[in-house]
Each structure stands twice: as C-alpha cells, then as structure tokens.
Interface confidence: low
C-alpha cells in the first residue's frame, strides 16, 4: 500500500464457500487499507501570505506599484516552493479610519487593476496555485475593523465574499478578529457564505492573540475555519513548552483541522533568533495540519538587518539589487538567487520540506503522536496506515545532547523501529539517507531531525 | 489631477524612427498600463499595444511588431513610443493613454480614460 | 480580432435632436467592456461610456448606451451644439482593443 490507496473487501470464510473467487493467500493475510480522509487543497501543503504587495516585488526596479502583474511573474517561484496557495493582500481600496472610502470591491489602483488581478487568477489556477484575498477592511488605518460602525463594514463584507467569489477567488482571510466585536457569528455568517458558494473555498481567521480559551471560543461556532494566531510565539522558543502547546492545542481543538504559524501576518524573523529558523521550518512542515508562512520567511528575509525597513513587510530580497538603498547591505546568501544556488541553504531546506510535506500519506494526514524525549526536545512521530512513517526530533537547546526517545509513550500502532533512515538534518554534517540507531542518537544545538522507517506489520 | 502630455510634433523622412514621449504626472506612474494608439489623418483609431511601467513588460498588436518599441523610465515618470522604418501611411496623430477603474454593479471596468494631447508625426521626402 | 461596424457614416441632425449611433460587432462583445468616445477636430478623444451603458465621471445625462452581445446603441437625446463631432465606439474585453470607424454628427 505504498503511496496508493485501493478497497480491499473483508472476506469471510462463509464467502470463500459459495461464490468462486480468485483471492490469492496474501490477500487474505493484508490488513484492511484504512480509508483516506477527504482531503481539500488547503490540507496538502503550505499557505504563502504576500501582506504588502508592493514590498513583495522589491525595489529593484524602482518603487513597484502596479504589483498584482509583477506576481504574475512570480508565480513559478511559488510553484518552485510547492506552496499550495497565495494569500494575497489586502489589495481593496482604503482611505485610513474613513469607512465611505473603503470599497472592498475595488482594487486599489497602486496595486494593479482588475484585469491584472484577473490575469492572476488565470495563470495561478494553470499553475495550481489558489488564491486568497485578504479582505480586512481597514488595513491601513487604527483599528482594522472600524469599531463604531461594525453592522456597516460587516456588510461590506458580505457583499465582497460574493462578488470576489464570483469573480473567481479561492478564499479569503481577515485579521485581527479580536477588533471584531460579534466576530463569532460574523465569521460563522461569512463561513457560510463562503462554503455555500463551494466547499472548496477557505476562510482563515487571524488574531493577534494567543490566548488558548480566546481561541477555543473562536473556533467552537466555527467548523472548518482554518485560524491563525499567536498561540505558538508564547513558546519561550524552548522544547518543553513547545511540546505542551502543541499537545494541548490539539487535544482541545479535539483534533479538528488546524493551521500552524507563529502570528498571523509577520515574518518568522519577528519572534526567532536566526539559529531556530531551520528547526521551525522543519516543525511547521510536519505538524498536522496547514503550516503558514509569511514572503520571506523561506529565506529567512529580516527587517532589522535592512536598514529603514518597516518590521512588518521589508522588502523581499530577490537578489543584491532588490535593496538599492544602502549599497553592500545585502550579500548574495541572504537572497533568493544566492540561496537557490545553494543546496544547504534555508531556500533549499524549505523547497524539500514543502516537497516532503505535499506528497507523502503521513506528513499529509498522518495521525500524530508526540512522545517523551531529552530535554529541550521536542519529538513526535507522524504515520498513516501501511505508508513510510516519519520520526520527528526537534532540539530547540543551546547544547548537543542525547534524544533519549521514551518510545514506551507510543501507542503500539505507532511503535519505533530500532533505527530509521536519516531524510533530513537541519544542519550540515550529516550523511542523508543513511540508518541512525535511535537509542543512540545525539543532537546538535538547535539541530532538527527528520527520520524515516517503514510500516512494520 | 491625472494629465499626460506628450512631446511636439515630428517631420521624418522615409526609412528613418521617431520617439514619442508622453509624460505622467498626477498619479503614481507605475501603477497603470501606458497604452499607446495611432490616428491616420481623417481615419479612426487604432490601438497599438501597452507597456506596463512597472514591470516594463510590453504588448504590441501584430500589426506593429518588429517595428515599435515602448520603454519608460519610471524616474521621470515617461514613457516612450518609438516606430522605426517609417513609410508615408505612419503619418498619424500618436496618442498615449491610461485606463481608469471604474466599479459598478458587481462589475470592474477599465475604459481609456486620461489621453495625451497627441503628437502628430509626419513622414515625407 | 473583434470588428466593429458604426453606422451610419456621417448623421446630419438639427440641435434639439435626437442622435442614435449604432455599434455592431463581427463576434459577441462582454456588455461590460464597451465604450463610446467622442472627438472633436484637433481634440484627443473623451471618454462617454464605458461598460455599454454607464456614463463617465462628468458626462451629462443626454447622453445614454445600451445594447448587449453584438449590436450596441449611443443615444444623444437633444443635440446640444458642442455635440457635433466624432464618435467612436471600442472594444476592450478581448486584444487586440479595437475601434469603429466612426460616426460623425454633423449640424444640418
């Protein structure tokens, strides 16, 4: 059942005396194929926000400002990091705080026009990448959802699901729901809207908070929301604690489908020091459920080493002209052409991830189990039924040390083998591909592991 | 307010290539399509293709291919129309022009808007 | 490419009058992405409508569209006399853009 899925009857001895089958002796002895999940687009990979458009582009051709064409452009890049949809914006009209000046239906004119928006969908859908339209109506001002008219901006907003629904979007994002007052039956009437269009559209939800019961409440009149939040940036960036919101994140939402990110809109680079980039790539890849990222984040792209650049969307360095402003500020190995050129970049390190995480059964919709480990360690296994199964082991600590894998935690469907095959190290040094004894595995500081190991009947 | 004006009027001989200018003040230049149009003498008018500012990308109609080049330079905020090896029926008002979005019904449309003023370029021996 | 055929050729009409120009099409045309213009005599061309039937920013009211698929109508309801002049209908939903080849109203 290697990578493919067939039905297999369960065949009693009572049939095997009437009708004549054919039914080999290997039929008889395999396991029952477990049933897959329905799975939609959103499940099979990774989220790309692209906030600020005009920043995406980057300067090098001067101040960008008619970006929705420059994406257009871009898209193979995308499709190089095997993303499985663009979330895009906002891009609607906004004169800051001024509710009569804000169209949702309207693109702004610095961004492009409606036929360059229209030409994107065109070729992002040949290219099978979604498209998600941020809508959050008051971007550029205070408070984005305009707090002393909320019945007026909510049904702007409903009248926007409908009109870019039907001009062809994939899906659609707003943040900073807890601005938002009645923001549970708001995004339970636009979910409504949205699936009702198609079950085959997505809602995400952002918050700025991380506030576990805020939100559960969120997420509990909300089936099917996918919501991003803050929730893993309270980590303390420590293996322990990790581990407990994780779980716990899990358990509670009772393992309903989830997404994983550490805000909703900013860079990786906001909340981690440069050495835990790789191993949060490597968590957000193989945890279930849509890892999230922000442009740049495969690159490690970082305001403050970009002097005069807005933390919340620095320019994307394509390459050393993406950033004219202070000549020498950027060396080749922090941009997308340097990194592409180096198999042991972060670029690299995310390109095979995605690729890992868009095709294999487990990382797809593997069940998860999380197990006990050294400390600073955060492991966890990922399997489905008779595909290849993946081992997890995460060192978020400043010292090497011993994973010491508690395996007696597991449950016996998911049991680990003595040794499994190193896929992928988050740092250098490591022979790929070849076997490691668990029992006897170390880690290096802040070294991530991504083992492999067969089903074993 | 959006205006465009473009450069003076132009006598070329057979053979020889004419730039036209067309220069975008009153909005961010680079984030609309620059569309490029030709008017013979009593006839109607014809589109000859964009350039869109921000990225440089271009689009000419067949007709005119292998012959027009459109640039910008997005300093000045200007673009610029070039036809080469001019025959006599190139004699024409060129116009530059910009699209404006307008939304209405559920609908975006992007009609030329805002036009140049023309160049009339002649061509005679 | 998409031909547009106006007509008639030339309208002579007394101010007061009422204009209708027509548009067709060689191949069906979206209503959303058509647009009438008007040029006068050394003048770059005005916008009028867009979208068959919406006027532009500043265009009064006398003058309307309408029409779908491939036959389109400029309905001038009383000539005024800067009204005399050129009009034009385009296409821009599908490239090559393209233009009629006019229709002039012309004073009696």
């Known amino acids: 059942h290697h990578h493919h899925h067939h039905e297999q009857k369960l065949i009693s001895e009572e049939d095997l005396g009437g009708e004549q089958k054919l039914i080999s002796e290997e039929d008889l002895r395999a396991p029952r194929c477990r049933e897959l999940p329905a799975q939609k687009w959103w499940h099979t990979g990774a989220l790309y926000r692209i906030g600020d458009l005009q920043a995406f582009q980057g300067h090098g051709a001067g101040n960008l400002a008619a970006p929705i064409s420059g994406l257009k452009g871009r898209l193979d890049y995308l499709s190089s990091l095997k993303v499985k949809g663009l979330v895009l914006g906002p891009i609607h009209k906004n004169q800051k705080d001024d509710v009569a000046q804000t169209d949702l239906l309207q693109i702004d004119p610095n961004f492009g026009s409606k036929e360059d928006f229209d030409s994107l969908l065109q070729s992002a859908k040949k290219k099978s990448i979604r498209v998600i339209l941020d809508l959050t109506p008051n971007y550029r001002g205070e408070n984005s959802w305009f707090s002393t008219q909320v019945d007026t901006v909510a049904t702007k907003v409903k009248d926007a699901l409908e009109f870019w629904l039907q001009a062809g979007v994939d899906g659609f994002q707003v943040r900073d729901i807890e601005n938002l007052k009645d923001a549970s039956s708001f995004l339970a009437e636009w979910q409504n809207i949205t699936k009702g269009f198609s079950e085959d559209r997505l809602l995400i939800a952002g918050t700025n908070s991380s506030d576990l019961q805020q939100i559960l409440s969120l997420l509990e009149s909300n089936k099917d929301l996918l919501l991003t939040s803050s929730y893993l940036s309270d980590s303390g960036s420590t293996g322990e604690h990790t581990k407990s919101l994780v779980t716990q994140y899990l358990n509670a939402t009772g393992n309903r489908w989830c997404s994983w990110s550490l805000s909703q809109a900013r860079l990786l680079t906001s909340f981690l020091p440069a050495q835990l980039l790789r191993l949060y790539q490597l968590m957000l890849f193989t945890l279930p459920g849509t890892p999230v990222f922000s442009y740049g984040d495969e690159i490690g792209l970082d305001a403050a080493a970009l002097p005069g650049q807005p933390m919340e969307a620095p320019v994307m360095l394509w390459d050393e002209s993406s950033f004219p402003d202070i000549p020498g500020a950027v060396s080749a190995n922090m941009t997308v052409k340097g990194q592409s050129e180096d198999p042991g970049s972060l670029l690299s390190l995310f390109r095979r991830l995605s690729d890992q995480r868009s095709k294999e059964r487990s990382l797809l919709h593997g069940d998860f189990h999380a197990f006990s480990a050294g400390p600073g360690l955060f492991s966890y296994i990922r399997h489905w039924d008779q595909n290849e199964r993946f081992l997890v082991v995460l060192n978020f600590g400043d010292v090497g040390l011993s994973a010491g894998l508690q395996a007696s935690d597991l449950p016996a469907s998911a049991s680990l083998p003595a040794k499994a095959d190193l896929l992928l190290s988050t740092q250098p040094g490591r022979e790929e591909g070849s076997p490691l004894e668990l029992e006897r595995l170390k880690l290096e500081p802040h070294e991530g592991l991504l083992l492999r190991f067969p089903y074993a009947a | 307010q959006v205006q465009l004006v473009q450069s003076g009027a132009e006598v070329k001989k057979p053979g020889a290539s004419v730039k036209v200018s067309c220069k975008a003040s009153?909005?961010?230049?680079?984030?609309?399509?620059m569309h490029w149009l030709r008017q013979a003498p009593g006839q109607g008018l014809e589109w000859m293709g964009w350039i869109n500012p921000n990225t440089g990308d271009t689009n000419y109609i067949q007709k005119f291919q292998g012959r027009v080049t459109m640039t910008r330079d997005t300093s000045i905020s200007t673009a610029y129309m070039e036809l080469s090896r001019l025959r006599s029926d190139d004699t024409a008002v060129f116009y530059c022009?910009?699209?404006?979005?307008?939304?209405?019904?559920?609908?975006?449309?992007?009609?030329?808007?805002?036009w140049g003023q023309g160049t009339l370029v002649t061509v005679s021996s | 490419e998409i031909v547009l055929t106006q007509s008639p050729g030339t309208l002579s009409l007394s101010p007061g009058e009422r204009a209708t120009l027509s548009c067709r099409a060689s191949q069906s045309v979206s209503s959303s992405y058509l647009a009438w213009y008007q040029q006068k005599p050394g003048q770059a061309p005005r916008l009028l409508i867009y979208?068959?039937?919406s006027r532009a920013t500043g265009i009064p009211d006398r003058f309307s569209g309408s029409g779908s698929g491939t036959d389109f109508t400029l309905t001038i309801s009383r000539l005024e006399p800067e009204d005399f002049a050129v009009y034009y209908c385009q296409q821009y939903g599908s490239s090559p853009w393209t233009f009629g080849q006019g229709t002039k109203v012309e004073i009696k």
């Open positions: 022009a910009r699209i404006r979005v307008y939304y209405e019904s559920g609908i975006y449309n992007y009609p030329l808007h805002h």
């Open positions: 979208g068959a039937s």
């Open positions: 009153g909005y961010t230049f680079t984030g609309y399509y």
